[in-house]
């Protein structure tokens, strides 16, 4: 059914909008879904209906439940459901996931964090902002209208931000808090089809029998944080882990970010005590991301011992 989740904390104000939107001229009736009892419109009640809005001033844990709103136009009645949950205040600083509003992302150029649901309330500036429960102080933070602006955003600015404001109803003040996560993304970031820097395609790698050999698979995937990017080795088209040769193992190398900002990954294939049969295998360096997969093949060849021939005139 047409329903919307709403949540709040006990002893704070909570205002819920009917999920069925109508024109301002349409009447809206609110009911307790379980009892079908009408919710009063008189403002002297702690819980009362005010057109499209249902107000809990303040909310109590016992208010949790499903509320029905019926929006009535001259010819149509449309029903919505508000699923309200009121939680006890947490004693510690952690804000549980169920109290979090949608995560927002910011970057150097755009670092606005909007205070969730604030448009439903009768509030006056300024908003108070907290990060991980600490009041935000310093010139980098500016509370502007219904949002927080962070200057010179850095990755360390990621975290949980809480806005706190006062709702005023007929001269009485009620506190409201709302929390959302903020993540920082690299605005210049982009993703490319993988580019394998090493090994070269169809490279022949010289190895000495009985010695150890290392092959490095190195690929770049774009700039900034990359999602679903990987490099790996295959032997004769089989994953190293499935190939079943304990002498041959792969090890993640360094995640590299060069001065030009490229995001690259390394995977080192370590062959212990190289044997003759290792020369018969096909070694594939695979680099893959959301754009696709690129493969470079390497073969091993025996390194000839250095000949110490006499030079005759």
């Amino acid at each position: 059914k047409f329903s919307k989740q709403s949540w709040g904390l006990e002893n704070e104000a909570l205002i819920v909008r009917c999920p069925r939107q109508g024109k301002p001229s349409y009447t809206v009736d609110w009911y307790y879904s379980q009892t079908n009892k009408s919710i009063p419109t008189q403002e002297r009640n702690r819980v009362f209906a005010s057109g499209q809005l249902l107000k809990f001033l303040p909310a109590a844990v016992a208010d949790s439940g499903i509320y029905t709103c019926i929006v009535r136009s001259p010819t149509f009645n449309r029903t919505g459901y508000a699923n309200v949950t009121i939680y006890k205040k947490q004693s510690d600083c952690n804000v549980p996931d169920y109290l979090m509003y949608s995560t927002v992302s910011g970057s150097e150029k755009n670092s606005k964090i909007y205070c969730p649901t604030i448009d439903l309330y009768n509030w006056t500036a300024p908003l108070e902002w907290f990060k991980n429960c600490q009041a935000l102080q310093g010139s980098r933070y500016r509370a502007h209208k219904s949002f927080l602006v962070i200057d010179n955003v850095m990755t360390e600015d990621a975290g949980d931000y809480t806005c706190k404001f006062i709702h005023n109803e007929n001269g009485a003040n009620y506190s409201v808090t709302a929390t959302r996560s903020f993540t920082v993304k690299d605005e210049q970031g982009f993703s490319l089809f993988p580019v394998i820097g090493a090994p070269a395609q169809n490279e022949i790698k010289e190895v000495e029998i009985g010695k150890n050999a290392n092959l490095t698979c190195s690929a770049c995937f774009g700039k900034g944080t990359q999602f679903l990017a990987a490099v790996l080795w295959q032997l004769n088209g089989t994953k190293i882990t499935d190939f079943g040769e304990p002498r041959i193992q792969q090890e993640e190398g360094q995640n590299q970010s060069f001065s030009n900002g490229l995001a690259c990954l390394d995977m080192v294939l370590r062959i212990a005590d190289v044997k003759e049969e290792d020369l018969l295998l096909q070694y594939d360096c695979l680099a893959l991301n959301l754009h696709g997969l690129r493969r470079h093949t390497v073969r091993l060849s025996r390194k000839n011992p250095i000949d110490h021939h006499s030079i005759y005139c």
Epitope: K1, F2, Q21, G22, K23, S73, T75, F76, R78, T79
Partner: antibody
Framework: EVQLLESGGGLVQPGGSLRLSCAAS????????MFWVRQAPGKGLEWVSA????????YYADSVKGRFTISRDNSKNTLYLQMNSLRAEDTAVYYC????????????????WGQGTLVTVSS | EIVLTQSPATLSLSPGERATLSCRAS??????LAWYQQKPGQAPRLLIY???NRATGIPARFSGSGSGTDFTLTISSLEPEDFAVYYC?????????FGQGTKVEIK
């Protein structure tokens, strides 16, 4: 009584243009979002375009985007559909219809429809 | 876009029988679904809105049910004037889309 009356249909060659009109009466025209819906001969219904009551917001089906333009004149209680670069597959009965709920950015049902006007695109 | 699939394509029944028409959405439309009736040479007529609410003037023999992706229009006892094509329509998001229709014909 709510009434919608389409006009302007007819035979047109591929690549040609046509302008459909829909005259509305019996309700406050400017308070309602209006739609064009078409029905090819022997086929089902296909939404074509919609326009908000104040005329600011317009919406189009991908199949007509860039070729058709919806507009309205609230002073004349009239809805329009300007159809350019017509193709054989645009051949259909075109209905204008009213959305009785009309809240910003969302659609509802169509409670009143005109009788339709036939557009035939053929060489 | 959300695709609505109606079944069956044709329903052959006699007056007085019960008709059950199905409409399945390719993704959830909550209860933002309507049913229309269309007779030859006429414009569609709204029967049901918000999945289960009868529009003004629609006889009680027409009822709608369902939510999410599966919806049903039931005509409890077919009257001669009920033989027509029935369309479902979703309006949860743009573009609004219609099903391909179910024809209810006299057996």
């Amino acid at each position: 009584e709510v009434q919608l009356l389409e006009s302007g249909g007819g035979l047109v060659q591929p690549g040609g243009s046509l302008r459909l009109s829909c005259a509305a009466s019996g309700f406050t025209f400017s308070s309602y979002d209006m739609f064009w819906v078409r029905q090819a001969p022997g086929k089902g219904l296909e939404w074509v375009s919609a326009i908000a009551g104040e005329g600011g917001r317009t919406y189009y089906a991908d199949s007509v985007k860039g070729r058709f333009t919806i507009s309205r004149d609230n002073s004349k209680n009239t809805l329009y559909l300007q159809m350019n670069s017509l193709r054989a597959e645009d051949t259909a009965v075109y209905y204008c219809a009213r959305d009785p709920w009309s809240t910003e950015g969302s659609f509802f049902v169509l409670d009143y429809w005109g009788q339709g006007t036939l557009v035939t695109v053929s060489s | 876009e959300i695709v609505l699939t109606q079944s069956p394509a044709t329903l052959s029944l006699s007056p007085g029988e019960r008709a059950t028409l199905s409409c399945r959405a390719s993704q959830s439309v909550d209860d933002d679904l309507a049913w229309y009736q269309q007779k030859p040479g006429q414009a569609p007529r709204l029967l049901i809105y918000d999945a289960s609410n009868r529009a003004t003037g629609i006889p009680a023999r027409f009822s709608g049910s369902g939510s999410g992706t599966d919806f049903t229009l039931t005509i409890s006892s077919l009257e001669p004037e009920d033989f027509a094509v029935y369309y479902c329509q979703q309006y949860i998001g743009a573009p609004i889309t219609f099903g391909q229709g179910t024809k209810v014909e006299i057996k």
